[in-house]
């Protein structure tokens, strides 16, 4: 019951984390314009990774796109990439989780294929959430970076604007959802591989009461194959026991066979 | 199409407080501040304030600070001036103007202070 | 406050002449984000509210003839007038659409000779 319960709430966080990652991917406000200088103005700065937008005196707010891929600088081209890789990975993630989860049946797909795809989509969803932080940290520092930098036309490095002294930008909302997004994907998988390592002794304690059982049902009887009870019995226990290591049992319950040698 | 409509002239006595009404119609309400302007007779024009009608959120020009209170009512698309405590230096047309840079303007609200 | 200071103050023309008026800002009204410059300019013919002619320093509002044109950056704007029209007589005002509070000059009157 723990087991199911880690890998449920495991799931349900990674879900919620990877649903932030997509959120601050798509977020405009990465960058915000440090109003500490010029508190009064009228004219209010922001960027994303994708564009850079203008709220002005009238309350309106204009975006513009950034329509070019070759002049973005290389910084900006690794966060996108990162996080777009953080998504993709917590997506497929999300995808095997779904199959994994305990709760849900799926033919007779055994527990330890349920334990692999937990111990997959864990290791899935610990990257996916490394990879957002790593982003967000990355644009963070290149803030910071820019921030202390007092050359008057310098090269900001965020969606190519060429940024005056006065216009300095601050860490905007979309990095404090990248980072506790990136943090909740890492705790559901850290949680989906901890729910995985529960998984994987219950099979095994199966197994060994299958072998068990399939042991002292055997009848070993020299009047061959049919007067063998001891197989009908063993398929009752395969029913019953229907957990994975089938060609062992089948081994287990043929030496009657032997009988007639 | 877009209409802002500001309500008729005021005659008011010194001392006295008046409510200035401006209603906005053909446009997204609360996408665009509602801004607030002062013209003295035969001068320039004098920016007082704005406010959000999204959130309530107001500005004012510190020379209009405590002089003008901004209000907002979403459902009739009105914003509201209240202008107190007033004196011969409060007689002026006063406008209202809406969207990206004061596109419209409402008809002016001729506002006269004399005992 | 950014002060705006619009010159000549009153300006005497006959139809069809070219006018040029200018508008200084204390600050810069560059704003380094969009790199545009938060200026405006205003037309108010008496009796009337002001009508948006120019915003951003050079975008003509749609329905003004292009006959107006507007120029200048960072503290230093221009209005021209290609060929006055008697319609155009009016008081012109300039805007600062930067920073708070907004800011207007004392305007431009147009006269006909």
């Known amino acids: 019951m723990a087991v199911t319960a880690c890998q449920g709430l495991g799931f349900v966080v990674s879900l919620i984390g990877i649903a932030g990652i997509i959120a601050a991917t798509c977020m405009d406000q990465w960058s915000t314009q440090d109003l500490y200088n010029n508190p009064v103005t009228a004219v209010f700065n922001y960027q994303g990774l994708w564009r850079s937008c203008v709220r002005e005196s009238s309350g309106f707010t204009e975006c513009r796109g950034y329509f070019t891929l070759l002049g973005l600088p290389a910084m900006l081209q690794a966060v996108r990439a990162l996080m777009i890789v953080g998504i993709v990975l917590g997506a497929i993630g999300l995808l095997v989780s779904i199959f994994a989860l305990k709760c849900i049946r799926i033919g007779s797909m055994e527990d330890s294929a349920k334990a692999n795809m937990t111990l997959t989509s864990g290791i899935m969803f610990i990257v996916s959430g490394l990879c957002a932080i790593a982003g967000v940290s990355v644009f963070a520092n290149m803030l910071v970076t820019n921030f202390w930098m007092s050359t008057a036309n310098m090269y900001t490095g965020m969606g190519g604007m060429v940024q005056t002294v006065q216009t300095r930008y601050t860490f905007g909302a979309a990095l404090f959802v990248g980072w506790v997004a990136g943090g909740l994907t890492l705790i559901g998988g850290v949680m989906m591989c901890i729910a995985c390592r529960g998984l994987a002794p219950e099979e095994t304690n199966y197994k060994a009461v299958s072998y068990h059982a399939s042991g002292h049902s055997v009848a070993y009887k020299p009047g061959g194959f049919k007067a063998s009870t001891g197989f009908g019995s063993n398929t009752k226990n395969k029913k019953i026991y229907d957990g994975g290591a089938r060609t062992e049992d089948e081994v287990q319950s043929y030496p009657s066979k032997h009988d007639y040698v | 199409e877009i209409q802002v409509q500001q309500s008729g002239p005021e005659l008011m006595k010194p001392g006295a407080s008046v409510k200035i009404s401006c209603r906005s119609s053909?446009?997204?309400?609360?996408?665009?501040?509602i801004h607030w302007v002062k013209q003295s007779r035969g001068k320039s024009l004098e920016w007082i304030g704005y406010i959000d009608p999204f959130s309530g959120g107001t500005r004012y020009n510190q020379k209009f600070e405590g002089k003008a209170t901004l209000t907002v009512d979403k459902s009739s698309t009105t914003a509201y001036m209240h202008l107190s405590s007033l004196t011969s230096e409060d007689s002026a047309v006063y406008y209202c103007?809406?969207?990206?840079?004061?596109?419209?303007w409402g008809q002016g609200t001729l506002v006269t202070v004399s005992a | 406050d950014i002060v705006m200071t619009q010159s000549p103050s009153s300006l005497t023309v006959t139809a069809g002449e070219k006018v040029t008026m200018t508008c200084k800002s204390s600050q810069s009204l560059l704003n380094s984000g969009n790199q545009e410059n938060y200026l405006t300019w205003y037309q108010q013919k008496p009796g009337q509210p002001p009508e948006l002619l120019i915003s951003?320093?050079?975008t003509r509002q749609s329905g003004v003839p292009d006959r107006f044109t507007g120029s200048g950056s960072g503290t230093d704007f221009t209005l021209t007038i290609s060929s006055v029209q008697t319609e155009d007589l009016a008081v012109y005002y300039c805007q600062n659409d930067y920073s708070y509070p907004l800011t207007f000059g004392a305007g431009t009157k147009l006269e006909l000779k």
């Open positions: 951003r320093a050079s």
């Open positions: 053909g446009y997204s309400f609360t996408s665009y501040y």
């Open positions: 103007a809406s969207l990206r840079f004061f596109a419209y």
